[in-house]
Interface confidence: low
């Protein structure tokens, strides 16, 4: 879309009166402490708010919490603390909200020192009523719901027991001791690691990986010498210690741990780590840390089995284990990911891929921006996006990049325009085409959110001073209106809107401070009268995603197909509505070499689409471990990219021969696994 207008412009008629009639204030009868907010269910309008306040006394800390409930998207709240017997709720466990629209809520209470176990409050009617339950253990983690059945809960105890409930927390059973980490898999399966010699830390690299498919009646050991494990898409990953030294390697299973294959990834040493950046049912992005305290590593993308990996991006910024990475899945357009690299001069630059990691490029410079002081050439520079790393470095970045699957093409992020990320105060940029082009949307840092599937964008300036103004745009951030939502400014703490970006309500949270006291306050604004009518067919326009060259017959082809979307015209001021479904028309593309990744032992030279044999492997038989057997690979170097739907065109041939020999390097071969029943 054309740039040209960056500041406010007259657009929506009589919006002040319309918004004033739909602005709802709620002052919470609370001393300021911390506040947490959760939506219960989808499109139910139910919000739970937990406020907690700690009073440090001489010998101990006295805590008080209050629970509030709204059933109209935050316009009105009712104090329901009495439903939980005025008990102090532990905020570190948050509010455990059940999956989908189960209406289930679990709150974990603080209990006095000598008690036998913890206490929870359970609701299965969207927090209208709660049942108090005393636990036979002290929880170490929040209750975890099975994704398939919200009556099934698991939790770890402070004594490392794995506890399971089959009746939504009414009755609990310890199914295993000495457990370090537990996760739900598919079909109510639980995966967990156990230690033998005293503690999780002491046994790191000597843990066992277990599986139960019947909630603890029977178990199977599916891995030994385990350092850690993770689930991503349909893949189960384990990092496994090598026999001879302190290195470890990734093994992968696609059958819940029955059989394992060694991933063709570099091994890592004690100080290094692996990290699953993103995974779906087709493939996985894996980060492999560089040796030494470099702060970077390499991104690899997998084949459809999670075994063969292609190098995707070098010098990928990722600080120490559990540290920060800017890797972001742009959910508003298929195949798009954004992340940061650490360049040789230690500056940080943003990179984007439009084809699921096949190629990475810099972000195009916004047309309405100048290159900043980081740019060597004032006419040539890129947009660099602030994400988790910038936030961790306490730069003036209040929010990470934002995209929503139902707001097609829209990406909003803080950024700077130059040769690298700048420490100067950032501005907010928007892309309406999934990251191909960008426009400066707002000057200076802001909080932002998307409403009505992109029909409205709301923003609030990030300021240390109290605020009373909200900005909104009905044309994807081109033009902005400002609305004063209260006469008395508040210290702003957060914007809250229902997850999924379908709502037309936004809640502004903050606190008022007077000489004597400070109180939590929320303002909920409903934009329904700004978007007065429902959108009609004429309000939408056809948009070809990933279009870069309209003259090219294959324009828009990514991963073997192109998609045309019906998108709301920027000029249309109307409601997409809560039932809005993204309308897209896919069409299959002809295969080209771009639709194939390089097979094991092959690589793509820069700026070349052909896969060539790795020099060090030339003339050698390509052998690798698959399901615990050694495989002999006969290949011309190509393998179809996972999820690629192309047909016809070029079709490289590939063949795998089974050598029927055992893999000595596979620590997770089937005969090392055993089963037992309780």
């Amino acid at each position: 879309s054309a740039p040209g207008e960056d500041e406010e412009c007259g657009r929506v008629r009589d919006f002040v009166a319309k918004l004033a009639n739909n602005t709802h204030q709620h002052v919470f009868d609370d001393l300021r402490g911390s506040v947490s907010l959760s939506w219960v269910g989808d499109s139910t309008g139910v919000i739970l708010v937990l406020t907690t306040f700690h009073v440090p006394l001489v010998i101990m800390t006295f805590g008080q919490s209050k629970l509030y409930r709204s059933e109209d998207y935050g316009k009105n709240f009712k104090d329901i603390t009495d439903l939980i017997n005025n008990t102090f709720i532990r905020t570190e466990f948050g509010m455990a909200i059940g999956p989908e629209n189960s209406g289930k809520v679990v709150l974990t209470a603080e209990v006095s020192g000598g008690s036998r176990g913890g206490r929870i409050f359970r609701s299965s009617d969207f927090a209208k009523n709660f049942v108090q339950t005393d636990l036979p253990f002290h929880p170490l983690t929040q209750m975890m719901y099975s994704p398939q059945n919200s009556d099934y809960l698991l939790a770890l105890s402070t004594e490392n027991g794995l506890w399971v409930s089959k009746n939504f927390g009414g009755k609990w059973e310890e199914i295993h001791k000495a457990v370090c980490l537990a996760k739900w898999g598919s079909d109510n399966t639980i995966f967990f690691t156990t230690y033998a010699n005293g503690s999780c830390k002491a046994d790191l690299g000597a843990l066992e990986l277990w599986r139960t498919s019947d909630l603890g009646k029977s178990f199977k050991t599916i891995g030994v010498k385990i350092y850690s494990f993770g689930l991503g898409g349909r893949f189960l990953f384990a990092s496994v210690m090598a026999d001879k030294d302190t290195t470890r390697r990734i093994h992968v299973s696609t059958d819940q741990g029955d059989t394992w294959s060694m991933a063709q990834l570099p091994s890592v040493g004690q100080e290094q780590f692996y990290s699953i950046l993103a995974a779906n049912d087709d493939m996985v992005f894996m980060h492999v840390d560089e040796p030494g305290d470099t702060g970077f590593g390499t991104i690899f993308t997998s084949d459809d089995r999670g075994i063969v990996y292609s190098k995707s991006l070098d010098r990928h910024l990722y600080t120490t284990t559990g540290g920060e990475t800017d890797f972001t899945n742009v959910t508003s357009l298929r195949g798009v990911y954004i992340t940061s690299v650490l360049s040789e001069d230690n500056s940080i630059q943003t990179m984007i891929t439009f084809d699921q990691g096949g190629r990475w490029t810099h972000l195009r410079k916004p047309e309405n921006s100048e290159c900043d002081a980081t740019a060597k050439n004032k006419n040539e520079c890129s947009l660099h996006i602030h994400a988790s790393y910038s936030i961790s470095q306490k730069l003036n970045v209040p929010m990470a990049p934002l995209s929503e699957p139902n707001a097609v093409g829209i990406v909003i992020a803080h950024g700077s325009v130059g040769d690298a990320i700048s420490v100067m105060v950032p501005d907010v940029y928007i892309s309406d085409d999934g990251g191909y082009s960008w426009t400066k949307m707002l000057e200076g840092p802001h909080y932002y959110t998307i409403l009505d599937s992109g029909g409205i964008i709301v923003a609030i300036e990030h300021s240390s001073r109290p605020i009373n103004v909200i900005k909104f745009s009905t044309d994807e951030g081109q033009c902005w209106q400002t609305y004063t939502f209260t006469r008395d400014p508040i210290y702003f703490t957060g914007l809250a809107s229902e997850p999924g970006a379908r709502s037309m309500n936004i809640s502004i949270w903050g606190f008022t401070e007077s000489f004597l006291t400070s109180q939590w306050v929320s303002y909920t604004i409903d934009f329904k009268d700004i978007l007065e009518r429902n959108c009609e067919e004429k309000d939408y326009t056809i948009w070809l995603a990933h279009s870069t060259d309209p003259e090219d017959y294959e324009d828009g082809c990514i991963l073997g197909y192109k998609e045309q979307f019906l998108r709301l015209r920027k000029s249309s001021v109307c409601q997409n509505g809560r039932d809005y479904v993204v309308t897209k028309q896919p069409s299959i593309c002809l295969c080209s070499l771009e639709d194939f990744l390089c097979d094991f032992g092959y690589y793509r030279p820069e700026n070349d689409s052909k896969c060539v044999e790795q020099p060090e492997l030339k003339g050698h038989d390509l052998e690798f471990c698959l399901y615990g057997r050694e495989e002999h690979l006969t290949t011309n170097g190509y393998r179809k990219i996972p999820g690629d739907k192309c047909q016809g065109g070029v079709n490289p041939v590939r063949e795998v021969k089974d050598l029927k020999k055992k893999c000595t390097s596979n620590f997770l071969s089937p005969e090392k696994q055993n089963s037992k029943s309780n």
């Epitope: 879309s1 054309a2 740039p3 040209g4 207008e5 960056d6 500041e7 406010e8 412009c9 007259g10 657009r11 047309e367 309405n368 921006s369 000057e443 044309d475 081109q478 033009c479 004429k538 326009t541 948009w543 279009s547 309209p550 003259e551 015209r569 920027k570 000029s571």
Partner: antibody, heavy 118, light 107 residues
Framework: EVQLVESGGDLVKPGGSLKLSCAAP????????MSWVRQTPDKRLEWVAI????????YYSDTVKGRFTISRDNAKNTLYLQMSSLKSEDTAMYYC???????????WGTGTTVTVSS | DILMTQSPSSMSVSLGDTVSITCHAS??????IGWLQQKPGKSFKGLIY???NLKDGVPSRFSGSGSGADFSLTISSLESEDFADYFC?????????FGGGTKLEIK
């Protein structure tokens, strides 16, 4: 009523300079982007330059880049076009145009004539 | 630059007729096109924006269609005040470019 009134057009020698103004009463000038567009004697239209509502951003056509400068004074509700190193091909009727939130040629002025001739 | 090819350059029509003017963009511009009217000796008036949207106050006998690279302006049941010059303009990317114009004359 929204109206735009251009002034400053004149006969000028090649290489000379001229400054055009566009007065913009009748609407909140500071919230709109503004453009200059010219119409040559053969009636062809050519977009010249655009400036954002706050004046932070300007864009030019390649034919005038480096010679013309678009600016605005929001306090005076006035848009300007400073033209220098004028050429005979700059001879045209110059119009200012308002960029609304919908699109970029929403309201037009009445025009002012610039003739570059020796 | 995007070249906007407008046709016809002129046409003679009668009152009450329906006419269509077309504009072809040298590359896809989605629906970032507007249509303008210029009466003899006068300035310009915006008629249509984003390809199909009628500007407030413009009679409903004017309509726009098309998207991508081919667009048209249709005027149904012509009235005397409609005899004027018409121009298309693309604002998909800088520099904004105009069609050569169509002169509508009374037959």
């Amino acid at each position: 009523e929204v109206q735009l009134v251009e002034s400053g057009g004149d006969l000028v020698k090649p290489g000379g300079s001229l400054k055009l103004s566009c007065a913009a009463p009748g609407f909140t000038f500071s919230t709109y982007g503004m453009s200059w567009v010219r119409q040559t004697p053969d009636k062809r239209l050519e977009w010249v330059a655009i400036i954002s509502s706050g004046g932070s951003y300007t864009y030019y056509s390649d034919t005038v880049k480096g010679r013309f400068t678009i600016s605005r004074d929001n306090a005076k509700n006035t848009l300007y076009l400073q033209m220098s190193s004028l050429k005979s091909e700059d001879t045209a009727m110059y119009y200012c145009s308002r960029s609304s939130s919908h699109w970029y040629f929403d309201v037009w002025g009445t025009g002012t004539t610039v003739t570059v001739s020796s | 630059d995007i070249l906007m090819t407008q046709s016809p350059s002129s046409m003679s029509v009668s009152l009450g007729d329906t006419v269509s003017i077309t504009c072809h963009a040298s590359q896809g511009i989605s629906s970032n096109i507007g249509w303008l009217q210029q009466k003899p000796g006068k300035s310009f008036k915006g008629l249509i924006y984003h390809g199909t949207n009628l500007k407030d106050g413009v009679p409903s006998r004017f309509s726009g269609s098309g998207s991508g690279a081919d667009f048209s302006l249709t005027i149904s049941s012509l009235e005397s005040e409609d005899f004027a010059d018409y121009f298309c303009v693309q604002y998909a990317q800088f520099p904004y470019t105009f069609g050569g114009g169509t002169k509508l004359e009374i037959k």
